[in-house]
Every structure is written in C-alpha cells, then in structure tokens.
C-alpha cells in the first residue's frame, strides 16, 4: 500500500510529450487552410533536486534549484521548450489569397529545466 | 470580504522578481572565493490567454495557451528566463589556486512565457 | 485586369436547383478564395460560403449546410455554385468574387411556381 | 457566428462634409480581417477597405478605414457626389463570414 502511494506521488522528470494541434479545435481552421494541424508536442515533468545533465538546464537553473532546496519559497526551474523547429503553412491573407508561410518556433524537439 | 478573497485568487502576470543570492546559503561559498552572493533574480507568474506582447512568448507557446484554454489536461505555458546574463567570480581548483572565470547564463535579465 | 463573367439569369421551379458559373480571365484564380454572396431584393449582402480551387477546399455558411455545393475547374478557371431545394426565398442576385476585390456582374436567381 | 451591427442605419449629409460610419462585432475579428464595400443600385459591391485599413487599388484617399477588435470605422473625408451609396462591412476571419446590414449614405 505503502509502495503503491509512493508510485503515484513519483512525479516523471521533465520530458516531451505527444499534442497533436488540430486547428479546427482552436478556431484557427478559418485562416490555416492547410495543414488541418500538426504534431507540436509540449513540455512537462519534474525539474528535481539535483538537476541531472540530460534536463539541459542553465547555470541559472542550477542555482534556482538549489535555492528551491533550501527555501521553498522560491520556485524550482520550469519544463519547457528548449529547441523549436518551423512548419510551413498555406494560410489566407488578408485580400483571402492562398500564401504559403514558414511560422518560426512552432513544434517541440526538445525540452529542459529553465 | 469577497474583494480581499478575489484580490487574493488574482495570480500577477509573468516577470521578474528579486533574489539575492547567498554562496554560504547554498553551500558554495567552500569553492567560490568572491563574491559572497550575487542577483541573480528569477522568473514567476502567469502566462493566461491570451498571451499579450510583452510576455515574450514564441508561437509553440501561444499555441499551447490556446490549447489549454480549450483543454486544461494540457499545461499552460511556464514563465522562465528568456535572457540571461554573465557574471565573472573568482574560485578555488582542484589545485586551490584561484582562478577568475565567466560564468554564463547566471543573472536573469528578461522573463517570457514559454 | 483580372475579370469574374458569371452566367446568365435563371427561373426556377420550387424544390429544383441551380447552378451558376463564375469564369475567370486575365489573372490568377486558383489560388484566391472564390467566394459566393448572394442579395435578395431590397435586402442586404448575404454570405454562402468560399472555395479555395488549389486545394479544393469549401467552406459554407450553417444557413446554406447541405444545400449548397461549391467546386472549380482549376483548367477553365472556373468557379461553380449549386443551389439545391430551391423555395421562393432564395429569390436573389447571386455573385462570386475572387478574394476581397474582384467581383461577377452578379446572376439575377428567380424562384417561381 | 459573428454579428456585425452598422450605424447609423441611414446617415443624410451634403457634398463635402465629412461621413464617419461605424462597425461594431458582438466578438472580436481576427487578425483584423474586415473589409468594407460600396454598393449602388443596380452594381455589385465595390471594395474599398480590407484588412481592416488598407485601401483597395483604384480607391480614392478621401476614403480610410480604421480600428480592431470589435470596433472599426469608415470614414469619407470629403463627400463627393459619387460616393452616396449603401456601405456594408463584413468580418472574414471566422467562419462563417459575416456582413453588417449596410449604412445608407444619403444626399442631404
């Protein structure tokens, strides 16, 4: 019982984790014309005590968390996007003709504790 | 009484906050030789929907405020550095022998939603 | 200059379709948003829906779901809107346009028994 | 859907005088994709504005258009004799697009 409880506060470590955006369900199917969406990806997990070098931190993420372990008033590092890649989209403009556009930052390929 | 508790619940957006902080707190102050501390600042607050301009947000981020605002399973965007800076300290190596080195990434200088 | 030639005025019978041609010529087509908006008389601009002829992708107004057809012929330049279960109502002057800035003369839709 | 509400309804004025016509949305248009149009009897609609502030080719400076997010405005500087006429306003950034029910510019 004891184990089981333990398993299930064992929060994972910061990683990536699959989003699938489909642009209808943000209202963005109007000016996206193609695709109907994309694999973005996002970020979550744990950034613990010590930062292990695989969670790609900042020599001010270091410190933040080992400030965090001595005075929990401030928070510990955040799980986010660490390197973005473009994806090219066909939207409308504003005269409704078809342009094809690379949007910068838009799909996640690797996360860390920041 | 209502007012106090929805001034309360009302989370301050995404910035920069003071830190200060103390090499003997954090158990450096053996190996760094001076300064005694530094400001190094941190990052805090909330990244709501919509993401405004001066929140520094790159695209995947406002999609993923976007998406959290139709499904909450998915995280919203985290307030962390977007800039940082250097400072330069002077430590002891393994030959106890001080050396004055730049650290980078140390002092936050800007914070975003990411 | 790029023109929108539609076809001509129609009667219709109530509960039959029509369909209206929007041809283009002199500028690029398919890769506008080809709308419809239609005007009964004495009232106001009424919008049906839009197609994108480079990817055949259509768009409709809810009022007009399952009653309205739009598709183009990318090799003639031409737009086409199908109207089906015609009722005295859709009694109006029925126009396309290419994006924003280029619109038909307009195709005057009569509904009569 | 997205509702367009113009006013006035009818606005009378003389040949030039200045003409200020409105267009509020019951939510806000993306991107400020909102276009105005000219209509006389008996023509199709002639674009004037789109994007909310761009003129469209061939369309004097006398007309300009201004504003987001739910408020937006036409203004004629200077009436001509041409420019009375109906104006509609219509938002076409959310499916489905939408038209105002027209401002009609009247000769005083």
């Known amino acids: 019982q004891a184990k089981h409880k333990q398993r299930k506060r064992l929060k994972s470590s910061c990683k990536r984790h699959p989003l699938y955006v489909d642009f209808s369900d943000v209202g963005w199917n109007d000016w996206i014309v193609a695709p109907p969406g994309y694999h973005a990806f996002y970020c979550h997990g744990e950034c613990p005590f010590p930062l292990a070098d695989h969670l790609n931190s900042t020599n001010h993420a270091i410190v933040q968390t080992l400030v965090n372990s001595v005075n929990s008033k401030i928070p510990k590092a955040c799980c986010v996007p660490t390197e973005l890649s473009a994806i090219s989209m066909l939207y409308l403009d504003e005269n409704e003709k078809v342009v094809l556009k690379n949007y910068q930052d838009m799909v996640v390929e690797g996360c860390g504790c920041r | 009484q209502a007012k106090h508790k929805q001034r309360k619940r009302l989370k301050s957006s995404c910035k920069r906050h003071p830190l200060y902080v103390d090499f003997s707190d954090v158990g450096w102050n053996d190996w760094i030789v001076a300064p005694p501390g530094y400001h190094a600042f941190y990052c805090h607050g909330e990244c709501p929907f919509p993401l405004a301009d001066h929140l520094n947000s790159t695209n995947h981020a406002i999609v993923q405020t976007l998406v959290n605002s139709v499904n909450s399973k998915i995280p919203k965007a985290c307030c962390v550095p977007t800039e940082l800076s250097a400072i330069s300290m002077l430590y002891l190596d393994e030959n106890e022998k001080v050396v004055l080195k730049n650290y980078q990434d140390m002092v936050v200088e800007g914070c975003g939603c990411r | 200059q790029v023109q929108l030639v539609q076809s001509g005025a129609e009667v219709k019978k109530p509960g039959s379709s029509v369909k209206v041609s929007c041809k283009a010529s002199?500028?690029?087509?398919?890769?506008?948003?080809i709308s419809w908006v239609r005007q009964a008389p004495g009232q106001g601009l009424e919008w049906m829906g839009r197609i994108i002829p480079i990817l055949g992708i259509a768009q409709y107004a809810q009022k007009f779901q399952g009653r309205v057809t739009l598709t183009a012929d990318k090799s003639t330049s031409t737009a086409y809107m199908e109207l089906s279960s015609l009722r005295s109502e859709d009694t109006a002057v029925y126009y396309c346009a290419r994006g924003k800035d280029i619109w038909g003369q307009g195709t005057m839709v009569t509904v009569s028994s | 859907e997205i509702v367009l509400t113009q006013s006035p309804g009818t606005l009378s004025l003389s040949p030039g005088e200045r003409a200020t016509l409105s267009c509020r949305a019951s939510?806000?248009?993306?991107?400020?994709?909102l276009a105005w149009y000219q209509q006389k009897p008996g023509q199709a609609p002639r674009l004037l504005i789109y994007g909310a502030s761009s003129r469209a080719t061939g369309i004097p400076d006398r007309f300009s258009g201004s504003g987001s997010g739910t408020d937006f405005t036409l203004t004629i500087s200077r009436l001509e004799p041409e420019d009375f006429a109906v104006y509609y306003c219509q938002q076409y950034g959310s499916s489905p697009c939408t038209f105002g029910q027209g401002t009609k510019l009247e000769i005083k």
């Open positions: 939510q806000s248009v993306s991107s400020s994709y």
């Open positions: 002199g500028g690029t087509f398919s890769s506008y948003a």
